[in-house]
Interface confidence: low
């Protein structure tokens, strides 16, 4: 029986009975938060062979091995992962070994085995036989290997039964428990699975099979399962489903997701039966099972029951995520907040149409309205008293409405009102009148020319750049000397710069009045020598990266209407030079014949330019005789077992420090102080652990159902 769409077993160990008839779990399996130690020996689920998503074990008291529970679990597909992991074993206080002796393949994702105080037999498993890449595995804070004394079957009787492989230059026997070897297929099978008798399975099999070279005898399928056969692709009129099987249209039409309402079933798109149309696509009609591309962002209509939606925090904005049409009125009242501009853009940036009015008042945290970056139509079907459909009052730091060079906004009905916005230039408001088609609708008092823009540099002159020079991590720029009518009114220049992969940034991107700003800022004084142009050296930049740069003159000059006169440049885009790339990642090599090596790697994390080729060098190494001399059975004295506490400590040094030549004299050496890089790595590691643990807790601790 196929079970799913995800099984969560918690609190009561008897819930395990739900797994009784499962051969495949289509989804995830959680076993967690069973605080009372139980006897699990009577629970055994030999039918379970495949989990299509991930397996998560967390705080299950009394469980000592998974081998008895899931003796035939062969494949974890990792179609969906838990924080990048397909197997998570976390804080399992009594687990002594993993014991999944039939686990042959984790198709996608890594493993995370952490804080299991009594867990051994970790170094005896060769995960590279199960996973494609082991570099992302995280196995930390378990019982120290020295205290485990892991012995594979037959080792003590000098009749070792298991095969050997090399991990981290250590050639050793591979097993899951004291009596279960890790199964390996003959090299003649290559990437194929094999039977218990080491006969090669059909290429479409994954994990194992009951008969050789037979696509109907697979335990699991490499690609897709259909009508008892493993197939490389789904046959005509069938569709991929949950990453592992083929289903027909009727089946897809009859599925109902946990998230969607009953009226909205699954869809068929690009040969797959899926819960929702993918990003950029929309259903071809409300009852349709098919997707068509959206023109622009996909439409999503949101409605406010109370007609007016107040946005006074990031939380209230969150409700509008993904909305493109808002039926109702928007009242924006953001007095404070952290990183507010980018948060608001994240949640409100797709809104294109507001059917009622938009009112922005007391929003002292806003510098710009550019977070409504797709707003193109205010219908004004409902208006404020006085027939206003766009109302902007008392926003102490509002400097920009939108970038009118790249913005079309229409206000279909109603007037605009602006008052007490001291940093908003009247010219900006007049520009909005022209763009939105409201010119002539406003009466004299609707746009107050004295209290809008009274504290802003409104009449801006243009600063021109005169030269730019780049290296791999530096940019030098200079610009014309700017002389306001009274040179004493020039305080300084401010240079703004930031990474800009695309030439589409504006001055107000990511900027709010609470200190958040996506731009880096540097102050530059005017050189006293009149012949020298002001300039700056920007250093510590990334190689082969495009930056956006602009300069503002900070002045005190007043012009007519007591408005401040200022100057600023256009935004300049400039790319640093290329540099040497960082090292290629995840280098793996394996031999597939007596005269060939296959080497695989991933691109460097920092290409620092356009990569055009790789250089591969190799050299012959002498055979290491040590591998043959060392007797792995004669364990050096195994230390007295100390119960590990499951925390992650630096291993204690039990031997005397080695005597080496240090600083020209013989004597015991102290450990070298950690380098900055090592300290940073440790800090990042601790941070990463914390992030994962938070993710785990947030994912699994849920309120009890009412």
């Amino acid at each position: 029986e196929i079970c799913g769409p995800g099984i969560d077993i918690r609190n009561d160990y008897q819930q395990l009975k739900r797994l009784e008839n499962c051969t495949v779990i289509e989804g995830y399996l959680h076993i967690l938060l069973i605080s009372k130690a139980e006897d699990y020996r009577s629970y055994r689920f030999p039918k379970l062979t495949v989990i299509t998503e991930y397996l998560l074990l967390f705080r299950v008291a009394g469980l000592e091995s998974l081998g008895d529970l899931f003796p035939n679990l062969t494949v974890i597909r990792g179609w969906k992962l838990f924080y990048n992991y397909a197997l998570v074993i976390f804080e399992m206080t009594n687990l002594k070994d993993i014991g999944l002796y039939n686990l042959r393949n984790i198709t996608r994702g890594a493993i995370r085995i952490e804080k299991n105080a009594d867990l051994c037999y970790l170094s005896t498993v060769d995960w590279s036989l199960i996973l494609d890449a082991v570099s992302n595995n995280y196995i930390v804070g378990n019982k120290p290997p020295k205290e485990c004394g892991d012995l594979c079957p037959g080792t003590m009787e000098e009749k070792p039964m298991c095969e050997k492989t090399t991990i981290n230059n250590e050639y050793n026997y591979r097993c899951w428990t004291t009596n279960r070897c890790q199964k390996m297929c003959p090299s003649t099978c290559g990437k194929r699975a094999c039977t218990e008798n080491n006969e090669c399975c059909h290429p479409e099999c994954l994990g194992s099979c009951s008969a050789p070279d037979n696509d109907t005898a697979c335990v699991a399928c490499r690609h897709y399962y259909y009508a008892g056969v493993c197939v490389p692709a789904c046959p005509p009129n069938t569709y991929r489903f949950e990453g592992w099987r083929c289903v027909d249209r009727d089946f897809c039409a009859n599925i109902l997701s946990a998230e969607s309402s009953d009226s909205e079933g699954f869809v068929i798109h690009d040969g797959e039966c899926m819960q929702e149309c993918p990003s950029g696509f929309i259903r071809n009609g409300s009852q349709s099972m098919y997707c068509i591309p959206c023109e622009g962002p996909c439409p999503k209509v949101c409605e406010e029951e109370k007609k007016t939606k107040t946005i006074d925090s990031v939380t209230s904005a969150q409700m509008l995520q993904g909305c493109t049409i808002f039926k109702g009125n928007l009242l924006i009242n953001i007095r404070r907040g952290n990183n507010i501009a980018s948060e608001l853009e994240n949640f409100m940036g797709l809104i294109e149409v507001v059917t009622g009015y938009v009112k922005i008042r007391h929003s002292h945290a806003l510098v710009s309205l550019s977070f409504l970056k797709n707003l193109r139509l205010i219908l004004g079907e409902e208006q404020l008293e006085g027939n206003y459909s766009f109302y902007v009052l008392d926003n102490q730091n509002l400097q920009q409405l939108w970038d009118w060079d790249h913005r079309n906004l229409t206000i279909k009905a109603g007037k605009m009102y602006f008052a007490f916005n001291p940093k908003l230039c009247v010219s900006e408001i007049y520009r909005m009148e022209e763009v939105t088609g409201t010119k002539g609708r406003q009466s004299k008092g609707d746009i107050n020319t004295r209290n809008n823009g009274e504290r802003a540099s409104c009449e801006s002159d243009v600063l021109h750049f005169t030269s730019t020079t780049t290296s791999k991590n530096r940019i030098i720029i200079t610009w014309h000397r700017y002389r306001p009518p009274d040179y004493r009114d020039l305080i300084s220049f401010t240079v703004y710069y930031k990474e800009a992969p695309f030439k589409n940034v504006t001055e107000y991107d990511g900027q709010d009045a609470c200190g958040s700003n996506s731009w880096n800022m540097v102050d530059v004084d005017l050189p006293p020598n009149k012949d020298v142009e002001p300039g700056i050296l920007l250093h510590g930049l990334k190689p082969w990266t495009q930056y956006a740069v602009y300069v503002k003159a900070v002045t005190l000059t007043m012009v007519e209407n007591d408005h401040i006169r200022g100057a600023k440049s256009e935004i300049l885009y400039i790319r640093t030079n290329a540099s040497v790339p960082s090292i290629p990642l995840d280098v793996l090599s394996a031999s597939n014949s007596s005269s060939q090596l296959i080497v695989k790697w991933n691109p460097p994390s920092l290409p620092n330019g356009n990569l055009s080729y790789y250089i591969v060098r190799w050299q012959r190494q002498p055979q290491d005789g040590y591998l043959y001399r060392h007797n792995y059975c004669s364990k050096d004295k195994i230390p007295i077992r100390k119960y590990a506490d499951g925390t992650i400590d630096i291993e204690e040094v039990t031997e005397n420090p080695k005597t080496e030549v240090c600083g020209g004299e013989k004597g015991p050496c102290c450990a070298c102080p950690k380098t900055e890089a090592e300290k940073q790595a440790e800090k990042e590691e601790a941070e990463y652990r914390k992030v994962f643990e938070n993710f785990l807790h947030n994912s699994i601790f849920v309120p009890r159902p009412e």
Epitope: E26, T238, V247, D250, F251, N254, I255, L256
Partner: antibody, heavy 123, light 112 residues
Framework: QAQLQQPGAVLVRPGASVKLSCKAS????????MNWVKRRPGQGLQWIGL????????RLDQNFKDKATLTVDKFSSTAYMQLNSPTSEDSAVYYC????????????????WGAGTTVTVSS | DVLMTQTPLSLPVSLGDQASISCRSS???????????LEWYLQKPGQSPKLLIY???NRFSGVPDRFSGSGSGTDFTLKISRVEAEDLGVYYC?????????FGGGTKLEIK
Amino acid sequence: QAQLQQPGAVLVRPGASVKLSCKASSYSFTDYWMNWVKRRPGQGLQWIGLIHPSDSETRLDQNFKDKATLTVDKFSSTAYMQLNSPTSEDSAVYYCTRSVIYYGNYRWYFDVWGAGTTVTVSS
Amino acid sequence: DVLMTQTPLSLPVSLGDQASISCRSSQTIIHSNGNTYLEWYLQKPGQSPKLLIYKVSNRFSGVPDRFSGSGSGTDFTLKISRVEAEDLGVYYCFQGSHVPYTFGGGTKLEIK
């Protein structure tokens, strides 16, 4: 359009087992449970049991555990129900009907029905 | 076994009237996954049953919106807002939450 074809009528002697067939077409046979439902003249519907064509997993109403045996032939996409030792009590219309694999949040209902086979037990 | 009791056994109505059929289960029919698999079927003379409502209140595709289902726990109702001639036949409720699955005894909708 998915269809289930059943023979119209079967006459059977008391005590002589009979095997009713239900041939599926125009859908993936192994993706749905096959259910059998009984309707006696002048009475209501009664669920007999179901079988999963992919692995022949069966669930029967205990009242029918000795009376009905459910089997499938994957290759011909046909489900069978054998009525053992029939008596006059077994004279009824027997319907086969499919339902979606039953788990999670899947919709669960009989969406396609056969026309029914009228079984008459008579000597 | 879950016993499903339908009332009334027979329901005479005039065309255009509202009809209401009740179905009561002997125990709660909430499945362990949280869903209530309660369905309504209509069987017309000489035909196979046809699905009307699934999971208490969801209309199957092609079923007119004059049919509606409601209820929870152990009490469920099928309503037909304006009865038409094509609605006549025997209505069955059915629970698919607990094996063995069981039908109600049926309600015959007929013309007054």
